[in-house]
């Protein structure tokens, strides 16, 4: 009986010779559980597993803890891959995180973290980041040290408020912090002075809601 080939991430898929960007099936580490992800095989050498994407506001990102844990949306459009999969993937191997951003004026920028991982659910999928480079700000817009993940039904931030309810979307809120890529999507000309938009402060400043965002990961030794 021929054993089915499984891939844990898009880098493995790329190295297997499948080098076209698109949706692929990934398998949880040490498991048969599967998840569908978008693989970017063109950006910067390819092999990127997309874990978040925003582009048009077609998907509601004000979701529950369970939904952020398991993932939602469509890998062909707006989606969240799932905290549990990303946690398991990044805890067993060293990954880099690239965050690609677009504004409404036609500019693009990125932040690259040389080491990224999420703690497990018992630690509220706390984010860990080191080694920031890139064009989207010299200071990390994800608060350092990393915060726990919060959603509308699971408040783990450091604010007297409930950041996820106030700003909308699940995120690694501080109190509430300089970023929220899962905030409310606002169209062009309605995207400034927003208290709950898609925010990356150290690139576009306060209240500016971005046009498009992509978070993607790849093994550091790719």
């Amino acid at each position: 009986k021929e054993e089915k080939t499984t891939f844990r991430d898009c880098a493995e898929i790329f190295k297997s010779g499948l080098t076209t960007s698109g949706i692929y099936t990934l398998t949880f580490p040490n498991s048969t559980e599967e998840v569908k992800a978008y693989c970017d095989m063109d950006m910067g050498g390819g092999g990127w597993t997309v874990i978040q994407h925003r582009e048009d506001g077609s998907v509601d990102f004000q979701r529950t803890w369970k939904e952020y844990k398991e993932g939602f949306g469509s890998p062909l459009g707006e989606y969240w891959l799932g905290n549990e999969f990303v946690s398991q993937l990044t805890s067993g191997h060293r990954y880099v995180l690239k965050i690609q951003l677009k504004d409404w004026e036609g500019s693009e920028a990125h932040s690259l973290y040389e080491h990224f991982y999420l703690s497990g659910e018992e630690s509220n999928y706390r984010i860990h980041l080191t080694g920031l480079t890139g064009t989207a700000g010299k200071i990390s817009s994800i608060s350092q040290p990393g915060s726990d993940f919060s959603t509308k039904d699971s408040d783990n931030d450091k604010c007297i408020c409930k950041c996820s309810q106030m700003l909308t979307g699940g995120w690694w809120f501080d109190a509430c912090g300089p970023s929220n890529l899962n905030g409310q999507y606002y169209p062009q000309k309605q995207n400034t002075n927003k208290f709950n938009g898609i925010k990356w402060y150290y690139w576009k400043g306060s209240g500016y809601s971005l046009k498009a965002t992509t978070m993607m990961i790849r093994p550091a030794d790719f």
């Epitope: 604010c159 408020c161 509430c176 912090g177 208290f195 938009g197 402060y201 306060s206």
Partner: nanobody, 129 residues
């Protein structure tokens, strides 16, 4: 639509006074803190003063304590900055900005710059003889 409009800037002699106004629309002051910031040419934007809880809590930078007074008129949805004993080093563009009042870190009294998501266009204050 959230809007903040500053007014009251101008040219004043050292030792003189000015009163800046910040008119807010699209939200009510009851649930928000309003900060005044300033930016001199070639310098970083810095916090000057802030107010929340209908004036129950106020903040002043050390450089303006005793000279500047912040106040609010919630019926007009406007915040004021009374600036007395002005000095040449007070010359800057003055901005007002808003943040939901609840967006406070446990144990803290005021807000970092990046929490202020709504900003006005600014008003220029020049202190010169």
């Amino acid at each position: 639509e959230v809007q903040l409009v500053e007014s009251g800037g101008g040219l004043v002699q050292p030792g003189g006074s000015l009163r800046l106004s910040c008119a807010a629309s699209g939200f009510t002051l009851d649930d928000y803190a309003i900060g005044w910031f300033r930016q001199a040419p070639g310098k970083e934007r810095e916090g000057v003063s802030a107010i929340r809880d209908n004036g129950g809590s106020t903040y002043y930078a050390d450089s303006v304590k005793g000279r500047f007074t912040i106040s609010s008129d919630n019926s007009k949805n406007t915040v004021y900055l009374q600036m007395n004993s002005l000095r040449p080093e007070d010359t800057a563009v003055y901005y007002c900005a808003a943040v939901p009042a609840g967006r406070l870190r446990f144990g803290e009294q005021w807000y970092p710059l990046y929490e202020y998501d709504a900003w006005g266009q600014g008003t220029l204050v020049t202190v010169s003889s």
